[in-house]
């Protein structure tokens, strides 16, 4: 009786979930392997997170305003684990927004979910952020390294959003 | 007071290249990004290209991507466009103009004179 | 691209009555609570000028008979007093997402 209930609320959640994501890719964790854990497909995930990398090119704020219509913002980088995971699926000739920014060019970035900018867990490339004009930053390889360069924002780039995992 | 001023405009064949300068006073030019904007006779106007202050970031629209470079000497004060494979249609006065940001967008805020462009055979 | 239309093409206004400009972004060029959209002045034989950036922020310097507003894909120039120096081409401006781009301009005469 009790799994039984157990899958008809997690049916009920799958349907509920199923208006805003077509599909859904879940796996089974927990201490018992009782909980399903899922992100939409095709994306990846990561610890409690949920990772999709979009190709369409569009300026910062159009990039934000697209992972936010699919549930999530431009990711937030809290790891060099993370960035390690993220960078596995990116193209090494290309550049992506991540969700942070400094909007006045005062030099305090932020990022988009207000996580508390800690600039001993960023990961700049050597002289970079350099202009106060770049107020929004990308992720691109650059002298054998995944690291971050302040840009323009209304330059289009690719960019990856990021969202909480779906518990079932 | 800020001041821009273009040269080295002129009459070239198709096809053809020219080199145009703005020379920049009465700021800092090497903190400032710069861009190049044209007006075709009796039109409107277009974004050419963009350079941000150190020279390291440089933006095109399609329609001269790959023909036109623009480039800056901040010793010198001065933004440059290369201007290669010239059409009939890039005919236009050419202005160099300074850009301040806006949050997450930008304005032209000080504009040169202009240096006039003539593509024909 | 993002596509920017004026209206009208030209506009013919008596001394000292209103004159207004509009513009349509093909579309939203807000984000956050901002507007990008700038509104430049282009007299004859000079350099566009900056009026308006910002959607409603007046330039330094500029005459506050100039005013702008609007938000997402509609936007406007106003110029509550037209004076005999108002006559020129006035231009929108996106600076959302490159290619920036212009409209097509309003001609601006006095009637």
């Known amino acids: 009786n009790f799994m039984y209930s157990k899958t008809v609320k997690r049916l009920s959640k799958l349907q509920e979930y199923q208006q805003y994501y077509p599909s859904l890719t879940c796996v089974m964790e927990g201490k018992d392997m009782e909980d399903w854990s899922c992100c939409p497909t095709p994306w990846t995930s990561f610890q409690s997170s949920c990772y999709f990398i979009s190709t369409v090119m569009q300026s910062w704020t159009k990039s934000q305003n697209n992972c936010s219509v699919m549930g999530a913002d431009l990711v937030v980088i809290n790891t060099k684990e993370e960035q390690d995971f993220i960078t596995q699926n990116l193209k090494i000739n290309s550049a992506y927004f991540l969700g942070l920014s400094d909007p006045k060019g005062w030099r305090h970035w932020q990022w988009v979910d207000q996580t508390p900018y800690n600039k001993n867990v960023t990961f700049w490339h050597s002289g970079e952020p350099n202009s106060p004009d770049e107020r929004c930053a990308i992720i691109n390889f650059r002298s054998e390294e995944w690291g971050w360069n302040d840009v323009h924002c209304h330059v289009p780039q690719k960019s990856i959003c990021k969202m909480k995992k779906i518990y079932i | 007071e800020v001041q821009l001023l273009e040269s080295g405009g002129g009459l070239v064949q198709p096809g053809g290249s020219l080199r145009l300068s703005c020379a920049a006073s009465?700021?800092?030019?090497?903190?400032?990004?710069m861009s190049w904007v044209r007006q075709a006779p009796g039109k409107g106007l277009e974004w050419v290209a963009t350079?941000?202050?150190?020279?390291?970031?440089?933006y095109y629209p399609d329609s001269v991507k790959g023909r036109f470079t623009i480039s800056r000497d901040n010793s010198k004060n001065t933004l440059y466009l290369q201007m290669n494979s010239l059409r009939a249609e890039d005919t236009a006065v050419y202005y160099c103009?300074?850009?301040?940001?806006?949050?997450?967008?930008?304005?032209?805020?000080?504009w040169g004179q202009g240096t006039t462009v003539t593509v024909s055979s | 691209d993002i596509v920017m239309t004026q209206s009208p093409d030209s506009l013919a206004v008596s001394l000292g009555e209103r004159a207004t400009i509009n513009c349509k972004a093909s579309?939203?060029?807000?984000?956050?609570?901002?507007?990008?959209v700038n509104w430049y002045q282009q007299k004859p034989g000079q350099p566009p000028k900056l009026l308006i950036y910002?959607?409603?922020n007046l330039e330094s310097g500029i005459p506050d008979r100039f005013s702008g507003s609007g938000s997402g894909t509609d936007f406007t120039l106003t110029i509550s007093s037209l004076q005999a120096e108002d006559v020129a081409v006035y231009y929108c401006?996106?600076?959302?997402?490159?290619?920036?781009?212009f409209g097509g301009g309003t001609k601006v005469e006095i009637k």
């Open positions: 401006q996106q600076s959302d997402e490159d290619p920036w781009t």
């Open positions: 103009a300074t850009y301040r940001p806006y949050y997450y967008g930008s304005v032209l805020d000080y």
């Open positions: 579309q939203s060029v807000d984000y956050d609570g901002n507007s990008y």
């Open positions: 009465g700021f800092t030019f090497s903190t400032y990004t």
């Open positions: 350079i941000n202050s150190g020279g390291d970031n440089t």
């Open positions: 910002g959607a409603s």
